[in-house]
């Protein structure tokens, strides 16, 4: 790919006119980035920063109660998950800078914006399955006595992350990078061309499968978890359940303007009004949901302050404290159904 | 008016090498990206590459970046290309178009008359 | 490289008769600015190319009204409604969106 002659461009950006004046010079140019770009910009620093150090921190703390406990084994993987994620911003960051253009190849334009989507389905799945796993923990904690495990754990992960890397397998296949002739810019993105259908059925299932489904299926699995916690008045059960609620919560508001915008450009003409408006939040409809990426463990050190009153102990040992303890399903052999129905909920943070 | 005066037809031998000229008239020379259009006989029209006289900024279609080379001389207004290690299949017409539009240098609004070039041993 | 295929090659048409010209593109023609630079061209034999239509569907001043561009995306069409002796020549089909620029290998339109 050629290099580009950006410091002294005699063209730069053009308000489109409907008539075309064949005499007019062109030399024009504005090199000012929108706000909506600066605004991801901003969002993108903050969250590389966050989602770098926490989640660092998070698999630091985690990885080394991973193999004994299970609430350990999965904020693992969804500190994972980000971690990775976060990865690619500084690539994605540079590029907004540069007015979205994409000096990194085709392979990068393949592979780093497809981590957010990968990021998204591995953190839903991994949300899901830890919310079976308190499920059980209330409603059927005889059966988790006897059979919930590491093992089972990694298994259920390792499904999650398989099903989340074949999910994001049509976004892998549809980025291509475009060489545009005027202004001289390469571009990352999706193209479909001749198939508008495939188009909207990928972001179909994207919002389906990445966002309706598990808000449902989630809602209805909390709402009888808060029920069944609320009849029992575990109130110390409640302040952990506010967690697993925040960081669940979390992923759909920060997801749904992503989601949002997805849908409507997938059935709306790419040279339509609303399209290029829509195509304009983009940047920040994607760092919008790239905070989920730093959320969770702002989350687990809010969460836990609450649950030390004061922050008293280092940032390591609260952390410890609110994501490794396990359920008193596997701590004790001899308890009683209630006991389990109550405290089974104790730093189960999501 | 605007008008893009191409040089002569030219005869060389392969390997050889030729330089190509197109002097413009009627309109600001550095104002406007001077592009070149190859044409083989009784076919379609292929992109070789531009040049903005202005910056001598030249960008090649890949398929000619190691044929064509692109250069301006802005006293005398005119846009050069060099073919070089011509072979046959650079026997063709070869056109010299400018480029405008209001919201950038899209549309080949001006074209030269065209230089045949043949090849021939 | 973006490839324009046109579609028919030849063209037969009747003075006064319409001419329907196809191009379709390998890949999208909309530019991230919203428009799509797919132009029209008509050269004539012994003659430069001349520019009839820019972005798909605006006819440049001088070209009668019987020219009409249509379609988006990669799917373009050029239609004559009337076609006169003047009209006869080869029309091509070109982008400016993407590099390189490219062009259909054009379509002759001649008497029947």
């Known amino acids: 790919m050629d290099s580009f002659n950006y410091t002294t461009p005699d063209y730069g950006h053009y308000d489109d006119k409907d008539t075309l004046d064949l005499n007019t010079p062109v030399d024009k140019t504005s090199n000012t980035l929108r706000v909506p770009d600066i605004l991801a910009l901003v969002i993108f620093a903050v969250v590389f920063l966050v989602g770098v150090l926490g989640n660092a921190l998070v698999v630091w703390v985690t990885a080394f109660e991973a193999k004994r406990t299970i609430n350990a084994i999965w904020f693992l993987n969804l500190a994972v998950a980000d971690f990775l994620s976060c990865l690619a911003l500084p690539i994605l960051f540079t590029s907004i800078v540069q007015h979205h253009h994409w000096p990194f190849g085709g392979a990068a334009c393949s592979i780093l914006p497809s981590l957010i989507l990968l990021n998204m389905y591995a953190s839903i799945l991994l949300l899901a399955t830890i919310s079976a796993d308190r499920f059980l923990l209330v409603f059927k904690p005889i059966w988790c006595q006897n059979f919930r495990g590491a093992g089972l754990a990694w298994i259920a992960c390792a499904v999650a992350w398989g099903l989340a890397l074949l999910l994001t397998i049509p976004s892998f296949l549809y980025r291509v990078v475009r060489e545009e002739y005027f202004p001289p810019k390469v571009l990352c993105g999706v193209d479909y061309s001749h198939d508008k259908r495939r188009e909207r059925a990928v972001a179909i299932v994207r919002l389906v499968l990445g966002f309706l489904w598990p808000l449902l299926t989630l809602t209805i699995c909390y709402t009888f978890i808060l029920l069944r916690t609320w009849s029992r008045r575990a109130t110390r059960s409640t302040k952990t359940l506010k967690v697993v609620v925040a960081v669940v919560a979390s992923f759909f508001i920060f997801w749904l303007p992503y989601q949002v915008t997805g849908i409507m450009m997938s059935f709306l003409e790419p040279s339509s009004p609303t399209f290029l408006l829509l195509k304009k939040l983009d940047s920040l409809c994607v760092s919008f949901a790239y905070i989920n990426c730093c959320i969770n463990p702002i989350i687990y050190v809010v969460a836990g302050q609450g649950f030390q009153g004061r922050l008293r102990k280092s940032l390591p040992s609260l952390l410890r404290n609110v994501l490794t303890e396990e359920s008193v399903v596997r701590e004790s052999k001899s308890f009683t159904r209630s006991t389990v129905d109550t405290m089974a909920q104790k730093t189960q943070a999501v | 008016q605007v008008q893009l005066q191409q040089s002569g037809a030219e005869l060389a031998k392969p390997g050889a090498s030729v330089k190509l000229s197109c002097k413009a008239s009627g309109y600001t020379f550095i104002s406007y990206w001077m592009h070149w259009v190859k044409q083989r006989p009784g076919q379609g029209l292929e992109w070789i590459g531009y040049i903005n006289p202005r910056s001598d900024y030249a960008k090649y279609n890949q398929k000619f970046k190691d044929k064509a080379t692109l250069t301006t001389n802005k006293s005398s207004s005119t846009a050069y290309m060099q073919l070089s290690s011509l072979t046959y299949e650079d026997y063709a017409v070869y056109y010299c178009?400018?480029?405008?539009?209001?919201?950038?240098?899209?549309?080949?609004?001006?074209w030269g008359q065209g230089t045949t070039l043949t090849v021939s041993s | 490289d973006v490839v324009m295929t046109q579609t028919p090659l030849s063209l037969p048409v009747s003075l006064g008769g319409q001419a329907s010209i196809s191009c379709r593109s390998s890949q999208s023609l909309v530019h991230s600015n919203g428009n799509t630079y797919l132009h029209w061209y008509l050269q004539k034999p012994g003659q430069s190319p001349k520019f009839l239509i820019y972005k798909v569907s605006n006819r440049i001043s001088g070209v009668p009204d019987r020219f009409s561009g249509s379609g988006s995306g990669t799917d373009f069409t050029l239609k004559i409604s009337r076609v006169e002796a003047e009209d006869l020549g080869v029309y091509f089909c070109s982008q400016s969106t993407l590099v390189p620029l490219t062009f259909g290998a054009g379509t002759k339109l001649e008497l029947r």
């Open positions: 178009a400018r480029v405008t539009g209001t919201e950038g240098p899209y549309y080949f609004d001006y």
